[in-house]
């Protein structure tokens, strides 16, 4: 009876996500068969989040809208480990929008999910950010410095990275 009600709950939760994510890839968390964590297929997972590399070229605002339609946001990078994971899936000759913008052009950077901007956990390329009307951030590869962030115009179409919390069923 307990297993039946758990299964019913799982199915109703899966139905919630079915509209945007018809297929989920789930793994068992820990030793308890009751706990599964899922990411939409073919998103990748790291710690408690799922990531999707969008290869369509869009402006920052459209990229964020695109992520939100999928129940995600443009990526918020919280640690060096997280960035190191993300870059494994990026192409060196491309740039990708992050969920980081400076709408006022006053170098008051803000993350899309309201995570406080911490200057100590940023990975700007040297000399960046460098331009008050470049109000959106990308991650890209520079041969001298490897992967890092750069400020660019928000209206320039780029690829992007979406991030959402894992789905627990």
């Amino acid at each position: 009876n307990f297993m039946y009600s758990k299964t019913v709950k799982r199915l109703s939760k899966l139905r919630e996500y079915q509209q945007y994510h018809p297929s989920l890839t789930c793994v068992m968390e820990g030793k308890d068969i009751e706990d599964w964590s899922c990411c939409p297929t073919p998103w990748t997972s790291f710690q408690s989040s799922c990531y999707f590399i969008s290869t369509g070229m869009q402006s920052w605002t459209k990229s964020q809208k695109n992520c939100s339609v999928m129940g995600a946001d443009l990526v918020v990078i919280n640690t060096r480990e997280e960035q190191d994971f993300i870059i494994q899936n990026l192409k060196r000759n491309s740039s990708y929008f992050l969920g980081l913008s400076d709408p006022g052009g006053r170098r008051h950077w803000q993350w899309v999910d309201q995570t406080p901007y911490n200057e100590n956990v940023t990975f700007w390329h040297s000399g960046e950010p460098n331009n008050l009307d470049e109000r959106c951030a990308i991650i890209n590869f520079r041969s001298s410095e490897e992967w890092g962030w750069n400020d660019i115009h928000c209206h320039v179409p780029q690829k992007s990275i979406c991030k959402m919390k894992k789905i627990y069923i």
């Epitope: 913008s101 709408p103 460098n130 331009n131 008050l132 009307d133 470049e134 928000c154 179409p157």
Partner: antibody, heavy 123, light 111 residues
């Protein structure tokens, strides 16, 4: 007073080249993204190119990509448009315009325009 | 590219009457409550002049008879009481995504 003055237009044969200049004054030129916008005789406005304030970013529509090059010299408060492989359909008045980003926003408008310089491509 | 469609192509209005110009974008040009819609006025033989930015904010020095409204894909420029000096062609423009694109223009004349 903000002023933008274009020069360098004229008559050129198809396949020829021309370099337009825009002299800026009355504002801190090095702080602004700049654009070239053109208008064919009796027609509407068509954006041609822009360049970021430091010159690191340039962008072009497909209609001119590979033929036109925008550049700037912040020390001289000058904007340039090098036009190669010119075609009859490039005939237009070319305006330089300044981008001004909305206060507290991610978007911009073109708040100052020069008087324009006429480019005629004809054999 | 985002296509901007203006209507009507031309408009004849009596002095002191209201003139309304519409602009429709092929996709939304909004984000987080802001619109990347601008309106310009161009008089014969002159460069364009910025009238309204962010859909509804009047540029400094522009008479208050000009107003802008709309969001998403549908925008309107209104001249509440047409004056002789308002005879011009009016253009809408989006700057949400490159390339920035203009509408085809609406020519306003006096009836």
């Amino acid at each position: 007073e903000v002023q933008l003055v274009e020069s360098g237009g004229g008559l050129v044969k198809p396949g020829g080249s021309l370099r337009l200049s825009c002299a800026a004054s009355g504002f801190t030129f090095s702080s602004y993204t700049m654009s070239w916008v053109r208008q064919a005789p009796g027609k509407g406005l068509e954006w041609v190119a822009y360049i970021s304030s430091g010159g690191g970013q340039t962008y072009y529509p497909d209609s001119v990509k590979g033929r036109f090059t925008i550049s700037r010299d912040n020390a001289k408060n000058s904007l340039y448009l090098q036009m190669n492989s010119l075609r009859a359909e490039d005939t237009a008045v070319y305006y330089c315009a300044r981008h001004d980003y909305y206060e507290g926003g991610l978007y911009y408008a073109m708040d100052y325009w020069g008087q324009g310089t006429l480019v005629t491509v004809s054999s | 590219d985002i296509v901007m469609t203006q209507s009507p192509d031309s408009l004849a209005v009596s002095l002191g009457e209201r003139a309304t110009i519409n602009c429709k974008s092929s996709q939304s040009v909004d984000y987080d409550g802001d619109s990347s819609m601008n309106w310009y006025q161009q008089k014969p033989g002159q460069p364009p002049k910025l009238l309204i930015y962010a859909a509804s904010t009047l540029e400094s020095g522009v008479p208050s008879r000009f107003s802008g409204s709309g969001s998403g894909t549908d925008f309107t420029l209104t001249i509440s009481s047409l004056q002789a000096e308002d005879v011009a062609t009016y253009y809408c423009q989006q700057t949400n995504e490159d390339p920035p694109t203009f509408g085809g223009g609406t020519k306003v004349e006096i009836k």
